[in-house]
């Protein structure tokens, strides 16, 4: 089996208030089966940004069609950026578990920061 890797190519993403930010994440394997989630921050207080299996995330859309059975692109777009959105975003692979899924591997993170407004 190829070992799964989580790839977040940008260490830093400069964004503009009011615009849409794209956070990239790809995986190198579909296995083990389980969902990919996005969080801002780390540890017990991290904020869930997107969960592919459930929930309502009105400002978040996926770049790819996650219903494709061979999908390896879990990149997301966050619309209407505000200063409150700054932080480091992690895509995290979970493997299935009972009763709860188990965190399997995290990407290295992408720091979202505000760039200068265009003049």
């Amino acid at each position: 089996e190829e070992e799964l890797q989580m790839i977040q190519p940008e260490k830093l993403l400069l964004v503009t208030v009011g615009k849409t930010a794209t956070l990239h994440c790809t995986v190198t394997s579909l296995l083990p089966v389980g969902p990919v989630l996005w969080f801002r921050g780390v540890g017990p207080g991290r904020e869930l940004i997107y969960n592919q299996k459930e929930g309502h995330f009105p400002r978040v859309t996926t770049v790819s069609d996650l219903t494709k059975r061979n999908n390896m692109d879990f990149s997301i777009r966050i619309s209407s950026i505000t200063p409150a959105d700054v932080g480091t975003y992690y895509c995290v692979k979970f493997r299935k578990g009972s009763p709860e899924n188990v965190e399997f591997k995290s990407g290295p993170g992408t720091e979202m920061a505000l760039g200068a407004k265009p003049s």
Epitope: L31, K53, T67, K68, N70, S98
Partner: antibody, heavy 118, light 107 residues
Framework: DVQLVESGGAVVRPGESLRLSCAAS????????MSWVRQAPGKGLEWLAG????????YYIDSVKGRFTISRDNSENSLYLQMNSLTAEDTAVYYC???????????WGLGTLVTVSS | ALTQPASVSANPGETVKITCSGG??????YGWYQQKSPGSAPVTVI????KRPSDIPSRFSGSASGSAATLTITGVRVEDEAVYYC???????????FGAGTTLTVL
């Protein structure tokens, strides 16, 4: 309420073609992958084909690959199964089913009966 | 191929377990589907190994471990008499597979 209603079942002769339809309502059809499952008389359930939400990716069981084509029209909230070169072994009730995020099924239609007989 | 017993029987109020083996835990999710008569629409009782739809009674539960999944009906009722099919989705092959079905008889 999620509703899936199949239609198009009929009695056909071996070698003929048939197109089944599944009308979906009560959910955002364009956000869900869909599948076709059949049940031959006195037999169990058999998954046939699946299609991604956008319709670009399709998946088939080997026994129908090349003969059956799954497709969808998201503007019409409809799923289709084009069946060619039918044989008596294709006689079955055909169900459409909505897929969960991990490609199992949560909602099913009532089914439509296809009979292939000379 | 997924393997499940052809039949099980129980008295009302008893606990019934139906097993489904043959999948690979690393690559397979399981679901369970109830069919009360041949040709009638199946009803999903469990998906994603252990997730129960909101309209399914809490006496139905699912679990998966190793290469097998289990459907448990705690306090079985006469109305639970049906054929129960397990299904697997294999993330290696992108294919869905059904077991042959288990006929539950409530005595």
């Amino acid at each position: 309420d999620v509703q899936l209603v199949e239609s198009g079942g009929a009695v056909v002769r071996p070698g003929e073609s048939l197109r089944l339809s599944c009308a979906a309502s009560g959910f955002t059809f364009s956000s869900y992958a869909m599948s076709w499952v059949r049940q031959a008389p006195g037999k169990g359930l058999e998954w046939l084909a699946g299609i991604s939400a956008g319709g670009s990716d399709t998946y088939y069981i080997d026994s129908v690959k090349g003969r059956f084509t799954i497709s969808r029209d998201n503007s019409e909230n409809s799923l289709y199964l084009q069946m060619n070169s039918l044989t008596a072994e294709d006689t079955a009730v055909y169900y459409c089913a909505r897929e969960t995020w991990n490609h199992l099924f949560d909602y099913w239609g009532l089914g439509t009966l296809v009979t292939v007989s000379s | 191929a997924l393997t499940q017993p052809a039949s099980v029987s129980a008295n009302p109020g008893e606990t019934v377990k139906i097993t489904c083996s043959g999948g690979d835990w690393y690559s397979t999710y399981y679901g369970w589907y109830q069919q009360k008569s041949p040709g009638s629409a199946p009803v999903t009782v469990i998906h994603s190994d252990d997730k129960r739809p909101s309209d399914i009674p809490s006496r139905f539960s699912g679990s998966a471990s190793g290469s097998a999944a289990t459907l448990t009906i705690t306090g079985v009722r006469v109305e639970d008499e049906a054929v129960y099919y397990c299904a697997g989705y294999d993330g290696r092959t992108y294919i869905n597979t059904f077991g042959a079905g288990t006929t539950l008889t409530v005595l």
